[in-house]
Interface confidence: medium
C-alpha cells in the first residue's frame, strides 16, 4: 500500500508589524512537537496592508477596520479553519505610534483601542495590540536573524545555509531601518556597556548573551528626511529649497504645516514667511551627505565613545545583518552584493543622484514616482548613518550583509517577538531526542 502522510501536527502564529509608513501581517508556522528546537519556525505568508501606518488614522479611526480587512481575511484563508481558535495574533506598533504617543497619549490609546476591537472580530486568539519599545524592537530583530541563521543551535554544521553565514556560533549584529526610527544591536567584544539603558542580558538555549542595543527615534528614513527639510528651510532665502538630495529637475511642493506636524522637526521649527515651499532637486551626493551629517550631533559624548547625539556605542564587533529599509533601498539601488565595496557604493550613489529626474522616471517607469523620488536621499542617508553615525569604515563595510529574507522568513523584529511571547526560546538547551516523531505510516 502507498505511504500516506498523517495530518500535519503544526501550529500557526500571526504578528502584525504596525510601522510608521505601513502595516504588514506575517504568518508563521512550526511543527507542534518541535516548539523548543531552534530554527523550526518559518514564515508562510506576508501580507502588506494597503495604506499608511496606523498612526495616520488618528482623525479617522472608523476606517481602521476596513484597512485591516484584506490581510486578516488572507490569514483566515491561509490558516486551516481547525487551527483558527488556537492561533495567537499579536500586533506590535513601532516608532510611528511612539511619536503619536509623545504628542498625545489619549490619541495613541484611541487608535490602539480601535485596532484591538477590529482584530478581536476575527476567529483567532487575539493577544493584544501594544506599542513596543525601541529596545524591544532592536532586541527582537537581533533574536530573529540569529534564530534564522542557526546561531543559537549548539549543533555545528559542516555546511552553510546562506551565503553570508560563517560556520561559527558568533552572533550577527542587527541593523534595522524603519520610516521613523533605526536600531543597532550587537554583542560587543569584552566591552562594558557603559549606559544601562543600552544593555540587555539574555540566556538563550543555555548560553548567556550581553547585548548592546539602541533605537534612534526620528532617525528612520522618512523622519530623517523631514528633519533635513526643516533644518534646510531655516536658511532658505525664499520659498524655493534647492535640495541636493533630489534629482536635478525634480520639483515638489511641501506644506509648512506638514513639515512641522511631526515631533521630529520641533527642534528646527520657526516662523516662516510662507505657507508652502518648493523643493527643487539639484542632485549632488556630496552636498546631500554634508546636509545629512548636520542631523548628527557628534560634538558631545559623555562616554568613551558615542554614535551621535551623546548616545553610547561600543566598538563594532563581528558581522551585521542590515534589514528592513536598509535592504529595500540598497536592493533597489542594486547595491546589496557582498562584492560591492563601500567606495563603489559611494561612487554609484554619486552617479545615481546626479541623474536627471526625467531620465530616472524613464529608466524606472514601473516604480511610483513618490517612492522613486526618495532613493537618492535614502541611499545617501544609509551611507551617512552607517559610516558617520555608527562608525563603520571602508574595511568593516564588508561585514555588513544586506538581508531581505533568511530561509524564506523576513528579517525583522516580528519573528523574535512571537518566539518570545509564545515561550519558544528556552533559557536552557532542550534535551535532544534521538528521533523526531515519524510523519509517515
Amino acid at each position: 500500500t502507498q505511504n500516506k502522510a498523517l495530518p500535519e501536527n503544526v501550529k500557526y502564529g500571526i504578528v502584525l508589524d504596525a510601522g510608521s509608513s505601513h502595516t504588514s501581517l506575517y504568518i508563521y508556522k512550526w511543527p507542534a512537537e518541535k516548539e523548543n528546537d531552534t530554527g523550526v519556525v518559518h514564515q508562510v505568508e506576508e501580507c502588506r496592508v494597503k495604506g499608511p501606518g496606523i498612526s495616520k488614522f488618528v482623525q479617522k479611526v472608523n476606517e481602521i477596520g476596513i484597512y485591516l480587512t484584506d490581510c486578516m481575511e488572507r490569514a483566515r484563508e491561509v490558516i486551516p479553519r481547525s487551527q483558527h481558535q488556537e492561533t495567537p495574533v499579536y500586533l506590535g506598533a513601532t516608532a510611528g505610534m511612539r511619536l503619536l504617543r509623545m504628542e498625545s497619549e489619549e490619541l495613541a490609546d484611541r487608535v490602539l483601542d480601535v485596532v484591538e476591537r477590529s482584530l478581536s472580530n476575527y476567529p483567532f486568539d487575539f493577544q493584544g495590540a501594544r506599542i513596543i519599545t525601541g529596545q524591544e524592537e532592536g532586541a527582537y530583530g537581533w533574536i530573529t536573524i540569529n534564530y534564522l541563521l542557526g546561531k543559537f543551535s549548539q549543533k555545528t554544521r559542516w555546511f552553510s545555509i546562506v551565503p553570508y553565514e560563517t560556520n561559527n556560533q558568533e552572533t550577527f549584529g542587527a541593523l534595522d531601518l524603519g520610516g521613523a526610527s533605526t536600531q543597532v544591536t550587537f554583542v560587543p567584544q569584552n566591552q562594558t556597556i557603559e549606559s544601562p539603558d543600552n544593555a540587555l542580558q539574555f540566556r538563550l538555549y543555555g548560553k548567556d548573551y550581553n547585548v548592546y542595543t539602541h533605537s534612534f527615534l526620528c532617525y528612520g528614513k522618512d523622519q530623517a528626511l523631514w528633519q533635513k527639510l526643516a533644518k534646510d528651510i531655516q536658511v532658505a532665502s525664499n520659498e524655493i529649497l534647492r535640495d541636493p538630495c533630489f534629482h536635478p529637475g525634480y520639483k515638489k511642493v511641501v506644506n509648512v504645516s506638514d513639515l512641522y506636524k511631526t515631533p521630529c522637526t520641533k527642534r528646527f521649527e520657526m516662523t516662516l514667511p510662507f505657507q508652502q515651499f518648493e523643493i527643487q532637486g539639484i542632485g549632488n551626493y556630496q552636498q546631500c551627505h554634508q546636509s545629512i551629517l548636520e542631523l548628527f550631533n557628534t560634538s558631545y559624548c559623555p562616554y568613551s565613545q558615542c554614535a551621535f547625539n551623546g548616545i553610547f556605542l561600543p566598538p563594532l564587533q563581528g558581522d551585521f545583518g542590515a534589514f528592513s529599509a536598509f535592504y529595500f533601498v540598497m536592493k533597489f539601488l542594486n547595491l546589496t552584493s557582498e562584492k560591492v565595496s563601500q567606495e563603489k557604493v559611494t561612487e554609484m550613489m554619486k552617479k545615481f543622484c546626479a541623474q536627471p529626474w526625467e531620465e530616472i522616471k524613464t529608466s524606472y517607469a514601473g516604480v511610483k514616482e513618490k517612492y522613486l523620488s526618495e532613493y537618492c536621499f535614502s541611499g545617501t542617508y544609509i551611507l551617512s548613518l552607517l559610516l558617520q553615525g555608527y562608525h563603520f569604515t571602508a574595511d568593516s563595510w564588508e561585514h555588513i550583509h544586506f538581508i531581505g529574507k533568511i530561509q524564506g522568513s523576513d528579517a525583522g523584529w516580528t519573528l523574535g517577538y512571537m518566539l518570545n511571547l509564545t515561550n519558544m526560546i528556552p533559557a536552557e538547551q532542550p534535551l535532544s531526542t534521538p528521533l523526531s516523531h515519524s510523519t509517515y505510516v
Epitope: 509608513s21 495604506g51 480587512t69 522618512d222 511610483k368 513618490k370
Partner: nanobody, 122 residues
Framework: QVQLVESGGGLVQPGGSLRLSCAAS????????MGWYRQAPGKQRDLVAA???????NYAESVKGRFTISRDDAKNTVYLQMNSLKPEDTAVYYC????????????????WGQGTQVTVSS
C-alpha cells in the same frame, strides 16, 4: 484632484429599494478602499459600507443583510444596492475614497463626493 459624483438617491417607500452609484473621475484601482457614508440631520457622518481594493466588504451592523456594496473597476464606479429600506435610513449618502499611500509617509488623501439625498417615507 479626484472627483466623485453620486447618483441614484431619491424618495422611496419603506420596504423599497434604491441603487446608488459613485463615479470617479479617474481609475479607482489605486484606491485602498471605497465606501459609502451617511449623515442624517443633526447627526455625525457614519460609515455604511466599504469595499477594499482586494474586494473585501465591511458593513455597519444596522445595514447588514439589506445593503450590498460592489465595484466595477472598468467603469471606475462603486455601487450601493439598498433593499428593505427603513425610515431610519433617511440621510444624505456620501461616496468616499481612501487614496494610495503618499510621499515619504505623508497622510494619504481622502476624497468625498457632494452627497445624494435618500428619503424613506410613506
Amino acid at each position: 484632484q479626484v472627483q466623485l459624483v453620486e447618483s441614484g438617491g431619491g424618495l422611496v417607500q419603506p420596504g423599497g429599494s434604491l441603487r446608488l452609484s459613485c463615479a470617479a473621475s479617474e481609475s479607482i484601482v489605486s484606491f485602498n478602499a471605497m465606501g459609502w457614508y451617511r449623515q442624517a440631520p443633526g447627526k455625525q457622518r457614519d460609515l455604511v459600507a466599504a469595499i477594499t481594493s482586494g474586494g473585501r466588504t465591511n458593513y455597519a451592523e444596522s445595514v447588514k443583510g439589506r445593503f450590498t456594496i460592489s465595484r466595477d473597476d472598468a467603469k471606475n464606479t462603486v455601487y450601493l444596492q439598498m433593499n428593505s429600506l427603513k425610515p431610519e435610513d433617511t440621510a444624505v449618502y456620501y461616496c468616499h475614497a481612501i487614496g494610495g499611500s503618499t510621499w515619504f509617509g505623508e497622510d494619504e488623501p481622502d476624497y468625498w463626493g457632494q452627497g445624494t439625498q435618500v428619503t424613506v417615507s410613506s
